[in-house]
């Protein structure tokens, strides 16, 4: 019996086609992804084959305006369009808090939202009962397949979930999920989930009973034979991995955007054991061309858009300094608001030792594209804000080591003068730069601002310690020279749209007045 | 209950090739690795090579390629290990074995 | 290929005491070692799967461990049918490998 498998992650509010490189189309003729893109793939993959699934790994949420606009109504109003047969939670779902995934997904959602490591507890469990499952067993064709669902334990530090949802460990979670699904006669099984490649790799190994494994978290590109694009393989597609039980298990997952639908060919033998697979991720490219009514209903729903990006956030009463001749040489008061907003969009998990999980932010100063006159009456845009950071990437979460952090510093001063992006922009940190020393010993103090404490003070750094950052993600992966950064970083969370979290910060504050302060000596 | 019952001892000489089988029942065939092991006289264990009789993929340790060759027949069930060129070397008791059962074994004796 | 080295390659022990195998593995395998038995007449058990989950009907004196890049098998009282040949398997990556082995003789 085979089984197709077509899935999708980390689609990230990319509802629209997009450049090659995920961001706004501006080229048609070579753009990439988008729903009505992929309605045209997965209706034609459907006509040609028996038996096909459509999932989703989850972090449809949080990418573009699409979001900021309709806040997961465009979600379900889409996949229900593209009839998903089912979805994980992923991270994201969560960023509008449990309330923002109720209201417009879980309960528009025609399809199953699945998680069985998060357990709902006290008011919230009876209303959010059934909006969500660990599994669901899905008829395809004249067999039943059982789909069960995990998500990050790290979101708590990553999104807004509440106190009310427990993240348990996935592998300890799933298990019984899968051997309750055995004990209905289920067994064909998928695990679908939002926890990264390395996760999804372990799930493989040690969950028995669990036949494939669909990821996402990680934007993982997998493709055997010749990369259609410009992503560079992790592996091979299907990425096999051999369980503790001696069973090759296949692991898949297709990048992020939209710009990829993955496709696996699963054969099955009549006690509902792999025998075979194969696939590729399929590049929906300009080749293939947008469904028009779905084409025709994302021009519906884009004329709301175009009204939000000319609509007053919040207003500014001091010149928002964000010229390359500011911001590339010294501290700038755009890139302050910029990293506050950073750190301010990233406060959660504080207990009894800690006041927040994170208290640091670095931005190339070359990510900074435009300034803000006040003299416009004050008012910020979504348009203005998209001058600014005109290159919808995201502010990640990483974990680096105070050396890696020392490097990064170095970098970031080790050919001043020439108007070059890395010199960076800071917050929660103060760094103080000799630049009559030689480039890779100019930095004379470097002080980090304490999260295991009740009141935030500025420490030295340590070497050996280990710290969370927030940064765009063109930091994290090696942008603009930071090489140390991708190559030394211990642990990448993907985060907001850098507009997003922006936008959102101002609105919260109404009335803004960044300063120059003295971070950056 | 899993079984995996293999072939009866060999007597080869050197040059010639022998044909070592490994009948499995019990369990689903075709969706878990077959290892092949060899274990010469008061020595350990060295990891020849495994299939998978699903697919057909076949894995090697270096040393053991062009020496044995890994065969798989769906339709009884059976695992296969080929050995050629046979040397004095080759003398030792060959299993197969899954993660979590392993055959009697086979021994192989090359004498002129 | 990953190497493993596996040590004391001979060890002599009285009944009842309680004795620690390890091998060391030249690369990250994870969780994936498994400890094997084998009885004099060339009997091969598995006891030990994914480092430290015992196989059913092992009994419980076996116990796997993992510390860093070393994995241990600890028998806690040895018992008579205890004193025969141990292995560990790594199914981290292909090609997998073999400890050389411990032989376990009674004291």
């Known amino acids: 019996w085979e089984l197709t498998i077509l899935h999708t992650n980390d689609v990230h509010s990319r509802l629209e086609q997009t450049s090659e490189d995920s961001s706004k189309c501006v080229n048609a003729s070579r753009c990439m992804g988008g729903v009505a893109r992929l309605f045209t793939k997965v209706q034609q993959i459907r006509r040609a084959e028996p038996n096909v699934l459509l999932l989703d790994a989850g972090d449809q949420y949080q990418g573009t305006i699409w979001f900021t606009v309709y806040k997961g109504a465009e979600v379900a109003h889409f996949m229900n369009a593209l009839r998903y047969d089912a979805m994980a939670l992923g991270n994201h779902e969560f960023d509008n808090g449990v309330e923002g995934l109720i209201e417009p997904l879980l309960k528009e959602a025609k399809f199953p939202i699945l998680s069985a490591n998060i357990k709902a507890k006290g008011p919230l469990a009876s209303q959010i009962s059934g909006l969500y499952l660990p599994y669901k067993v899905l008829p395809v064709g004249d067999e039943v397949v059982g789909i069960v669902g995990y998500t990050s334990k790290e979101t708590p530090f990553l999104s807004n979930p509440g106190t009310n949802l427990v993240f348990e460990d996935e592998i300890t979670a799933l298990q019984p999920e899968v051997d309750k699904l055995k004990t209905l006669n289920v067994n064909k099984i998928i695990a679908l989930g939002h926890s990264g490649f390395e996760t999804d790799k372990l799930i493989a190994q040690k969950v028995r009973g669990v036949d494939v494994v669909v990821g996402g978290h990680s934007n993982t590109f997998l493709y055997t034979g010749n990369p259609p694009s410009k992503e560079v393989p992790a592996g091979k597609y299907p990425f096999i991995v051999t369980s503790d039980d001696g069973r090759k298990v296949p692991v898949v997952q297709a990048y992020a955007f939209g710009k990829y639908l993955g496709y696996l060919k699963i054969e099955f033998d009549e006690r509902g054991n792999v025998i075979s697979s194969h696939g590729n991720p399929i590049l929906l490219n300009s080749s293939i061309p947008e469904d028009p009514s779905i084409k025709a209903d994302i021009n519906k729903w884009r004329i709301k858009l175009d009204n939000y990006s000319t609509q007053e956030l919040g207003k500014t009463i001091v010149y928002l300094d964000g010229s390359s001749q500011s911001c590339r040489f010294r501290e700038c008061n755009m890139g302050n608001l910029i990293c506050d907003a950073m750190i301010n969009n990233n406060l959660r998990h504080a207990d009894e030792m800690f006041w927040n999980h994170v208290s640091m932010c670095i931005l190339n100063g070359g990510g900074i594209r435009s300034p803000i006159d006040e003299r416009n009456n004050g008012t910020i845009t979504w348009e203005n804000l998209a001058a600014v950071l005109p290159f919808g990437g995201t502010f990640d979460l990483v974990q680096l080591k105070g050396s890696t952090l020392k490097k990064a510093f170095e970098h970031s001063v080790h050919r001043y003068g020439q108007s070059t992006g890395e010199f960076l922009q800071v917050g929660g940190i103060h760094v103080v730069y000799d630049l009559s020393r030689k480039p890779g010993d100019r930095v004379v103090k470097l002080d980090v601002l304490c999260t295991k404490c009740r009141v935030p003070s500025y420490d030295p750094l340590k070497m050996d310690e280990i710290y969370k950052v927030i940064l765009p993600n063109f930091l994290a992966n090696g942008g603009d020279g930071f090489q140390m950064i991708k190559d030394e970083l211990l642990r990448h969370d993907s985060g907001d749209q850098d507009i997003n979290v922006v936008s959102t910060y101002i609105s919260k504050m109404k009335v803004i007045y960044p300063a120059v302060e003295g971070r950056i000596k | 209950q899993i079984q995996l019952q293999q072939s009866g001892a060999e007597l080869a000489r050197p040059g010639a090739s022998v044909n070592l089988s490994c009948k499995a029942s019990g369990y689903s065939f075709t969706s878990y690795w077959m290892q092949w092991l060899k274990q010469r006289p008061g020595q350990g264990l060295e990891w020849i090579g495994a299939i998978y009789p699903g697919d057909g993929d076949t894995r090697y340790t270096q040393k053991f390629k062009g020496k044995a060759t890994l065969t798989a027949d769906k339709s009884s069930s059976t695992a296969y290990m080929q050995l050629s060129s046979l040397a004095s070397e080759d003398s030792a008791v060959y299993y197969c074995?899954?993660?979590?059962?392993w055959g009697q074994g086979t021994l192989v004796t090359v004498s002129a | 290929d990953i190497q493993m080295t596996q040590s004391p390659s001979s060890l002599s022990a009285s009944l009842g005491e309680r004795v620690s195998l390890t091998c060391r593995a030249s690369q990250d395998i994870g969780s994936s070692l498994n400890w094997l038995q084998q009885e004099p007449d060339g009997t091969f058990k598995r006891l030990i799967y994914a480092t430290s989950t015992l196989d059913s009907g092992v009994p419980k004196r076996f116990s796997g461990s993992r510390s860093g890049s070393d994995y241990s098998l600890t028998i806690s009282s040895l018992e008579s049918e205890d004193f025969v040949d141990y292995y560990c398997l790594q199914y981290a990556s292909f090609p997998y490998t073999f400890g050389g082995g411990t032989k376990l003789e009674i004291k």
């Open positions: 074995a899954l993660f979590s059962y």
